[in-house]
């Protein structure tokens, strides 16, 4: 739970954040997990700790391993683990899957590609961007802050994009590269006022106390890629995240494209261990886009367990 994978290339800078947060945090100590040896904080070392961050300047293949961070405060100490893998640089242009960050999707209206992990580094603009190892040139490509903007996106723009920047530490410069895939969504389509397919307006959903319950909010917004479309749940008019009940969480479902080609979204509301007080809440399925917002309200009712007589 408190472990995080991090990876980098040899001879590049790699900065890793402790996956455990203090509440509050006074100091963070880092150790090599295998030897329990403390990692120094002096910046003259190639590998050193700096608060929540562990810095490899530059990284070496031999640095691979598990690192322990302990977030200390007067009350409680919290332990996290960073699983670090440093790879040799590939001689060819191919970027292997294990070096790829999460894929992002874009469309004609929205084509930002963020440079992964860049927030951890002390870098200055501009970023260099490459697609399939070729430096990006031409007025369609604009490096802006920590992301790349592509104008008039076409399907041919799909591919692997690498950002390259320089991390500066006490006057010394270190190179960093990070790669992620970019996919292009079809933009042919139109947008409608949201249509909520489920739940029905003022639906009563039967649930069993003590059991888990799922409510699905499903809505369609038009055809093709939608510039702004969202489905979400509210409890008594409050966002789930603000309601502060950990038993009730929302989870994004799959983007759906029905046979008629409509672009639809699902949001599942999961209620763990249904309690009596959950029956008193108003559950609103909200669907919104540029045309407006539609709301369907659901209430829960107790399902009476059926008596089975022999």
């Amino acid at each position: 739970k408190f472990s995080k994978q991090s990876w980098g290339l040899e001879n590049e800078a790699l900065i890793v954040r402790c996956p455990r947060q203090g509440k509050p945090s006074y100091t963070v100590d880092w150790y090599y997990s295998q030897t329990n040896k403390s990692i120094p904080t002096q910046e003259r070392n190639r590998v050193f700790a700096s608060g929540q961050l562990l810095k490899f300047l530059p990284a070496a293949v031999a640095d691979s391993g598990i690192y322990t961070c302990i977030v200390r405060s007067p009350t409680f100490n919290r332990t996290g683990y960073a699983n670090v893998t440093i790879y040799k640089k590939q001689s060819d242009c191919n970027v292997p899957d294990y070096l790829m960050y999460s894929t992002v999707s874009g469309s004609e209206k929205n084509s930002k590609i963020y440079c992964p992990t860049i927030d951890l580094y002390n870098w200055t603009a501009p970023l260099e961007w490459f697609k399939n190892c070729q430096a990006l040139q031409g007025s369609r490509y604009r490096a802006h802050k920590s992301f790349l903007v592509i104008d008039n996106v076409m399907t041919e723009d799909a591919g692997d994009y690498t950002c390259k920047f320089i991390h500066n530490e006490n006057g010394a410069n270190y190179s960093v590269t990070a790669t992620r895939s970019f996919t292009v969504k079809d933009e042919q389509g139109f947008s409608l006022f949201p249509v909520i397919g489920a739940p029905a307006q003022n639906e009563i959903k039967e649930v069993e106390i003590g059991k888990n319950a799922n409510l699905t909010c499903s809505a369609c917004f038009g055809k093709g890629t939608q510039f702004l479309a969202a489905v979400l749940w509210q409890l008594n008019g409050t966002k789930i995240t603000d309601f502060g009940e950990p038993r009730i969480q929302q989870e994004e479902g799959q983007n759906q494209s029905f046979s008629n080609g409509l672009a639809c979204l699902d949001m599942v509301l999961r209620i763990a261990d249904v309690k009596e007080e959950d029956l008193l809440l108003q559950y609103d399925c909200l669907a919104l886009n540029l045309h407006g917002l539609r709301r369907h309200t659901v209430r829960l009712s107790r399902k009476n367990p059926i008596d089975h007589h022999s």
Epitope: K23, Y26, T27
Partner: antibody
Framework: QVQLVQSGAKVKKPGATVKISCKAS????????MHWVQQAPGKGLEWMGA????????VYAKKFKGRVTITADKSSSTAYMELSSLRSEDTAVYYC???????????WGQGTLVTVSS | DIQMTQSPSSLSASVGDRVTITCRSS???????????LYWYQQKPGKAPKLLIY???NLASGVPSRFSSSGSGTDFTLTISSLQPEDFATYYC?????????FGQGTKVEIK
């Protein structure tokens, strides 16, 4: 917005046990330590102890150790403070208070008055 | 335990006055991380304390800029540059350097 709502005032006899609840909302309960602070009538503030709701780990002030038990129920985002072997000097307002990433005692409950009287 | 001593225990002032409250700790509140773990709270009758200042000199969210705090490792000062009607309350200093966390005995600011 963040809210800590405590249970109502209680009157107890010497030797009895009192249990106060503190229901949190507006933030992720397990992401904040919960502390308890005592304030006797006309007196100052005294730290009693704390819990990390994520792990259930607790820490107590020496003065209250052995008499105080702090617990947390993640499912209802509620923290509890139980004080046993009550005596008249335990008559006080008890506050629950939550921490943030930057500091302790960021949010406070409205307080619960406990009166110990025979 | 770290002792926190405030002075004065009470003071009378008028709206617009500059008010200074001092707090002394029995041990330096300077942590090895360079932060001084000194806090100030305001409490009004029948209400819960409210955080004013954290880590010596940082204003908590929503606190007016007329409140300020300064000090070294053991001697601290809370200043209200121009006292407002809503500032009449009791003020507590506290340390969060080490357990047990301790508070000063409070300074009551009353209307003259």
């Amino acid at each position: 917005q963040v809210q800590l709502v405590q249970s109502g005032a209680k009157v107890k006899k010497p030797g009895a046990t009192v249990k106060i609840s503190c229901k949190a909302s507006g933030y992720i309960f397990i992401d904040s330590e919960m502390h308890w602070v005592q304030q006797a009538p006309g007196k100052g503030l005294e730290w009693m102890g704390a819990i990390d709701p994520e792990t259930g780990d607790t820490v107590y002030a020496k003065k209250f150790k052995g008499r105080v038990t702090i617990t947390a129920d993640k499912s209802s985002s509620t923290a509890y403070m139980e004080l046993s072997s009550l005596r008249s000097e335990d008559t006080a307002v008890y506050y629950c208070t939550g921490s943030t990433t930057d500091y302790y005692f960021a949010y406070w409950g409205q307080g619960t008055l406990v009166t110990v009287s025979s | 335990d770290i002792q926190m001593t405030q002075s004065p225990s009470s003071l009378s002032a008028s709206v617009g006055d500059r008010v200074t409250i001092t707090c002394r700790s029995s041990k330096s509140l300077l942590h090895s991380n360079g932060i001084i773990y000194l806090y100030w709270y305001q409490q009004k009758p029948g209400k819960a304390p409210k955080l004013l200042i954290y880590q010596l000199s940082n204003l908590a969210s929503g606190v007016p800029s007329r409140f300020s705090s300064s000090g070294s490792g053991t001697d601290f000062t809370l200043t209200i540059s121009s006292l407002q009607p809503e500032d009449f309350a009791t003020y507590y200093c506290a340390q969060n350097l080490e357990l047990p966390f301790t508070f000063g005995q409070g300074t009551k600011v009353e209307i003259k």
